[in-house]
């Protein structure tokens, strides 16, 4: 007697009736009614049996508008997932003020989540359909492979970056000096070599270590995930202790906020210039703007009081430009790279990740270039016969000249993914022979030779006012790092949400499924297992959307925005205007 | 071609017993868990009993420690002891392979394939 399929209901919409159908209260039912000893009572099903056979139905007993309905969303759910991390693929490509160590992690995880898009929710939605597997046993172990590596290597890449966060924020003076793209990429690789190992070889030769296949035709599963304690193990270390990690490593970054908010209210709340000083030189660990970390931890006291005034520190690679950077002006990717001054330190949030070949700290004073009157250079001998008035604007800074050679440096500003709109000034440090009397050693001729000559009292009174004006900004630009970090707070609290959101349903069911064999119907199932692959269609979301570059190089890319000019014109408009004017009618301060 | 052939129904007295066999063809039966449904006229189909890959067995309350499921790998049958029969278990029998570990041991639909069916028919 020839046998006939019954999976005629969908496998996603239980409620829809064709032959072989449940009742809708079939799929809902509770777990908590499952007896002593196993038995089960159960609710009765709807009876109106037919004798096709839709094993071999390529719409697997499901109606044509079900069929359309399941493809068209999750069509759209892959095309987005493909289009989105695609995007980001291509912007870190094509934009190389996107090329910090951040973002590689942001580029792996992205292969990883659009492995998925393009291979996994494919391949699972025809399953679904058909619902059963037609490729045959290679393709089922091979996708399943695909499928567990991908998703593995995504959950890894998230763990990766809640670690590079969590120690970018927490340890900045030892972590950050080791934080290069060649670690990065052994991170990287190790969340792929972990992936592959843990499933790749598990997957694909189990059947032959075990001597038989058990996956029965049509059906395509992991073999050696037929036991349900070994599904659960599998779980634990792919979900359970990754979302545990995770959470702690958040938490603690947000209580460091917290604490630093704190630390703040506390600046704030005082003026003093003792208490200016240990703000711009704080003993606990932060991160690397807002601490203004030294390269050396050891330097002298009186180096300390003499830059304790107002500086900041800036991550760079050199101030010099090389023949490469002469050379962006010509080339066809100039306009990705918004190298000057303003806008190298603009770049957007992805700031925090900057890896340096030969990553230094210093600090570097801006040259003021005024009219009539010779560059100043780490001077505090300041020309007296004009004065200089500061605008509204932020003070002690100067935005550099226009066509001054570019410039690459990046600020070790907070945390990346957040869109916080980044500063566009570049500070001034003041050398402050005020109250001292006297400088310390520095490698600058032009200090050695004017830094010790007497200050006029206007010039004394100009000094104190931009030491008083400046500590000010400081902790406006401690308060404006905070706010990023919040905002980075924010995104990795997004991100983790996200994470739990879509992975939790999918891991309960096996986590269910170990104490209660059978019990979860196949479309509960199918439902977790998808929830699971929009983790990898938020993913772009979460962090590149979170990201002011990533942004701004998805709408060039999106509205095919190829003209130099507009672009240049975009980046121009971003720059702000110079703070320091001279002012020609004479005025006593 | 896989083919699920159920046998041993027929007419009882209510308290009387008996043993349906389902004897599968096409498919390896110790890759598949088995289930057991009915069918009364004129009312909706039950889950009766099912097994699992892993040995464990669920019966529906009713039939609880009346009925039980049971199989024979090696002769590629499942079968399902009814003792203590009642006049309610008349109905038209089914067995069903479930192929997914992924799936319910009463959900119908979750079940790869059936058999067509054999009557019991309990008189009082």
């Known amino acids: 007697m020839t046998l006939h399929s019954n999976s005629t209901t969908s496998p996603l919409f239980p409620n829809i009736s064709s032959s072989w159908v449940h009742s809708p209260s079939e799929a809902g039912l509770p777990l908590g009614t499952v007896t002593q000893l196993g038995s089960y009572n159960i609710s009765q099903e709807t009876g109106n049996f037919s004798s096709n056979d839709t094993s071999s139905d390529p719409l697997g007993g499901h109606t044509i508008w079900q069929v359309v309905f399941i493809a068209f969303l999750t069509g759209f759910l892959a095309l987005v997932t493909i289009i989105g991390n695609i995007l980001v693929i291509v912007a870190f490509k094509v934009n190389k003020q996107l090329k910090t160590v951040n973002n590689y992690f942001l580029l792996s995880l992205a292969c990883a989540d659009l492995i998925i898009g393009v291979i996994s929710m494919n391949l699972f939605t025809t399953y679904i359909i058909m619902n059963r597997w037609a490729l045959g046993n290679l393709a089922c172990d091979l996708w399943l492979s695909i499928d567990y590596v991908a998703s593995n290597a995504s959950v890894m890449n998230l763990l990766v970056i809640s670690f590079d966060r969590y120690f970018s924020i927490t340890r900045p003076l030892t972590y950050r000096a080791k934080r290069t793209t060649k670690r990065a990429g052994v991170m990287i690789g190790l969340a792929w070599v972990i992936s592959f190992v843990l499933w790749a070889p598990a997957i694909l030769f189990w059947q032959y270590f075990v001597g038989k296949r058990t996956v029965p035709p049509g059906e395509c599963f992991i073999q050696f995930l037929s036991e349900p304690t070994i599904t659960f193990g599998t779980a634990i270390a792919a979900f359970y202790m990754p979302v545990t990690i995770m959470t702690i490593l958040y938490w603690r970054i947000y209580k460091e906020t917290e604490k630093r908010t704190k630390e703040l209210a506390g600046l704030q709340a005082s003026g003093t210039e003792a208490e200016a000083e240990n703000f711009v030189h704080p003993t606990g660990s932060s991160r690397s703007c807002s601490s203004y970390e030294l390269q050396q931890q050891g330097v002298k006291r009186s180096s300390r009081r003499k830059y304790g005034r107002c500086h900041f520190w800036f991550t760079t690679k050199s101030w010099k430009p090389s023949a490469e950077q002469m050379d962006q002006d010509h080339s066809s990717s100039d306009s990705w790279n918004n190298n000057d001054a303003a806008a190298s330190l603009e770049n957007s949030a992805s700031s925090d990740e900057e890896d340096i070949g030969s990553e230094t700290r210093a600090i570097y004073s801006i040259v003021l270039k005024l009219p009539g009157h010779s560059s100043i250079l780490n001077s505090t001998k300041l020309p007296s016969s004009d004065n200089l008035q500061v605008s509204n604007e932020d003070l002690g800074t100067v935005d550099v000249e226009r066509n001054a050679h570019k410039l690459q440096a990046q600020k070790s500003m907070g945390d990346g993914d957040n869109c916080q709109k980044d500063f566009t000034k570049l500070p001034i440090q003041l050398e402050s022979a005020v109250d001292t009397g006297k400088t310390s050693d520095t490698n600058s001729s032009a200090d050695k030779t004017t830094a010790t000559l007497p200050l006029s009292f206007k010039e004394a009174t100009l000094a104190k006012r931009f030491a008083l004006k400046t500590r000010s900004q400081i902790t406006k630009r401690k308060r404006m790092s905070l706010i990023k970090e919040k905002k980075a707070a924010q995104t990795l609290s997004a991100i983790l949400l996200a994470f739990i959101i879509t992975w939790t349903p999918y891991n309960i069911m096996v986590l269910v499924n170990t104490f209660c064999d059978s019990c979860i119907p196949k479309t509960y199932w199918n439902l977790g297992y998808w929830l699971c692959y929009i983790n990898s269609t938020v993913n772009p979301v979460c962090y590149a959307l979170c990201n002011k570059t990533f942004r701004t190089t998805f709408k060039t890319l999106l509205l095919c925005q190829c003209d130099k000019r507009k672009r240049r014109k975009q980046q121009y408009q971003q720059r702000q205007s110079v703070i320091f004017h001279k002012r020609v009618p004479e005025q006593a301060l | 071609q896989v083919q699920l052939q159920e046998s041993g129904g027929g007419l009882v007295q209510a308290g009387g017993s008996l043993r349906l066999s389902c004897t599968a063809s096409?498919?390896?039966?110790?890759?598949?868990?088995m289930g057991w449904f009915r069918q009364a006229p004129g009312k909706e189909r039950e889950f009766v009993a099912a097994d699992t890959w892993n040995g464990n067995t669920y019966h529906q309350d009713s039939v609880k420690g009346r009925f039980t499921i049971s199989r024979d790998n090696a002769k590629n049958t499942v079968y399902l002891q009814m003792n203590y029969l009642k006049p309610e278990d008349t109905a038209v029998y089914y067995c069903?392979?479930?192929?997914?570990?992924?799936?319910?041991?009463?959900?119908?639909?979750?079940?790869?394939?059936r058999g067509q069916g054999t009557q019991v028919t309990v008189s009082s």
């Open positions: 096409g498919l390896t039966l110790s890759n598949y868990a």
């Open positions: 069903a392979a479930r192929g997914s570990r992924r799936s319910a041991y009463y959900s119908s639909s979750d079940y790869t394939y």
